[in-house]
């Protein structure tokens, strides 16, 4: 790497993925293995991130840009850059300090993360419930009362309400 | 480079913001970023850090949750509110910067200086 | 909480010598260690971080190795200009609740 040229920062010329080492008289020096620099004209280079345990690597590091991580089969990152990997739950459950727990009667959870949060509530809209909720789907609202008077398009009536099996919290 | 602003001379009890502005770089790139402080004469101990990333994660040593308060108030800025303070806190704040996801700081600030006495 | 505990508090060494510093931290941090130089009236510097990998432009003269509970710092043909205090510091970001970091105590390093 030449030594830069600039009168006014030395420094300012030395490209993404060097730095300019002090050490040696400002010339532009590589990253050492395991870092970056993605701007140029920098005096030290970032900490390439490591991907580990329950993170695996999605993109490498290299000279100019730091790695990226996801999260391991069973697992599902939190926050932007994957900073946490967070245990997947099955729908119908959350995860709580002691584990997966099925959601609650009157809530659901229809992916492998989150919370259980409350069924729809129809009547609030004036409509009825349609289909029941589970654990895992909240309830489809249908017409209200009102809409289904004789001679109305047939809605075939829901099957009869069953409580979805869940565990003491 | 970093630079700490805020340290003052200020009474038990009082509270005060430090700010640490980034410069050659700005938040778009996600990093974590940190405060460290030293008493005099004394060694290094972490207070906390944020995440610059859109979730803004915030991590603070055990000692220093509910008195200290770390965010994000622009890209090329991090500040650090502190409560309640007593003469213990009198020390030397740092601000740092983490790329790795695990406590290694390549970038540190000179320091801003915070002495509690009455 | 992670403790890292920094052993010896203070070395002695003549120039060209070498120093060990050793770190152990209370629990399992794999690779997760860095080593910092402070110099009196300056911030600390990075010298290794993922307990083996050398900063951007620290001399070759430091070394780092260790994993898991035990770490060591190599100091060989000690200069003048590595008189200073050197900390290691471990720790992993798990979750807003549950974080580790924390820096040893300090080793003064004194050239004669």
């Known amino acids: 790497f030449e030594r830069t040229r600039s009168l006014q920062d030395p420094c300012s010329n030395c490209p993404a993925g060097t730095f300019c080492d002090n050490n040696r008289n400002q010339i532009c020096s590589p990253c050492p293995p395991n870092s970056f620099s993605s701007a140029g004209g920098q005096r030290t280079c970032d900490i390439c991130r490591q991907c580990k345990g329950v993170f695996r690597t999605r993109k490498e590091c290299s000279s100019t840009s730091n790695a990226e991580c996801d999260c391991t089969p069973g697992f599902h990152c939190l926050g932007a850059g994957c900073s946490m990997c967070e245990q997947d739950c099955k729908q119908g459950q959350e995860l709580t300090k002691k584990g997966c727990k099925d959601c609650c009667f009157g809530t659901f959870n229809d992916q492998k993360r989150g919370i259980c949060r409350p069924w729809t509530n129809c009547s609030l809209d004036g409509k009825s419930v349609l289909v029941n909720g589970t654990k895992e789907r909240d309830v489809v609202c249908g017409p209200s009362p009102a809409d289904l008077s004789p001679g109305a398009s047939s809605v075939t009536p829901p099957a009869p309400a069953r409580e979805p099996g869940h565990s003491p919290q | 480079s970093l630079e700490e602003a805020g340290g003052d001379l200020v009474k038990p009890g009082a509270s005060l913001t430090l700010t640490c502005t980034a410069s050659?770089?700005?938040?778009?790139?996600?990093?974590?970023m940190c405060w460290v402080r030293q008493a005099p004469g004394k060694g290094l101990e972490w207070i906390a850090c944020?995440?610059?990333?859109?979730?803004?994660?915030t991590y603070y040593a055990n000692w220093a949750k509910g008195r200290f308060t770390i965010s994000k108030t622009s890209s090329t800025t991090v500040t650090l509110q502190m409560t309640s303070l007593t003469a213990a806190d009198t020390a030397t704040y740092f601000c740092?910067?983490?790329?790795?996801?695990?406590?290694?700081?390549?970038?540190w600030g000179q320091g801003t200086l915070v002495t509690v006495s009455s | 909480a992670l403790v890292m505990t920094q052993t010896p508090a203070s070395v002695s060494a003549a120039v060209g010598g070498t120093v060990t510093i050793n770190c152990q931290a209370s629990?399992?941090?794999?690779?997760?260690l860095a080593w910092y130089q402070q110099k009196p009236g300056q911030p600390p510097k990075l010298l290794i971080f993922?307990?083996?990998d050398l900063a951007s432009g620290v001399p070759s003269r430091f070394s780092g190795s260790g994993s898991g509970t035990q770490f060591t710092l190599t100091i060989s043909g000690v200069q003048c200009d590595d008189a200073a205090t050197y900390y290691c510091?471990?720790?992993?970001?798990?979750?807003?609740?549950?974080?580790?970091?924390?820096f040893g105590g300090g080793t003064e390093v004194v050239v004669k």
């Open positions: 740092a910067r983490d790329s790795s996801s695990y406590y290694m700081f390549n970038l």
């Open positions: 993922y307990a083996s």
């Open positions: 510091q471990g720790g992993y970001y798990t979750s807003s609740t549950d974080t580790r970091g924390a």
């Open positions: 944020i995440y610059t990333g859109s979730s803004g994660s």
């Open positions: 050659g770089f700005s938040f778009t790139s996600s990093y974590y």
């Open positions: 629990e399992d941090i794999d690779n997760y």
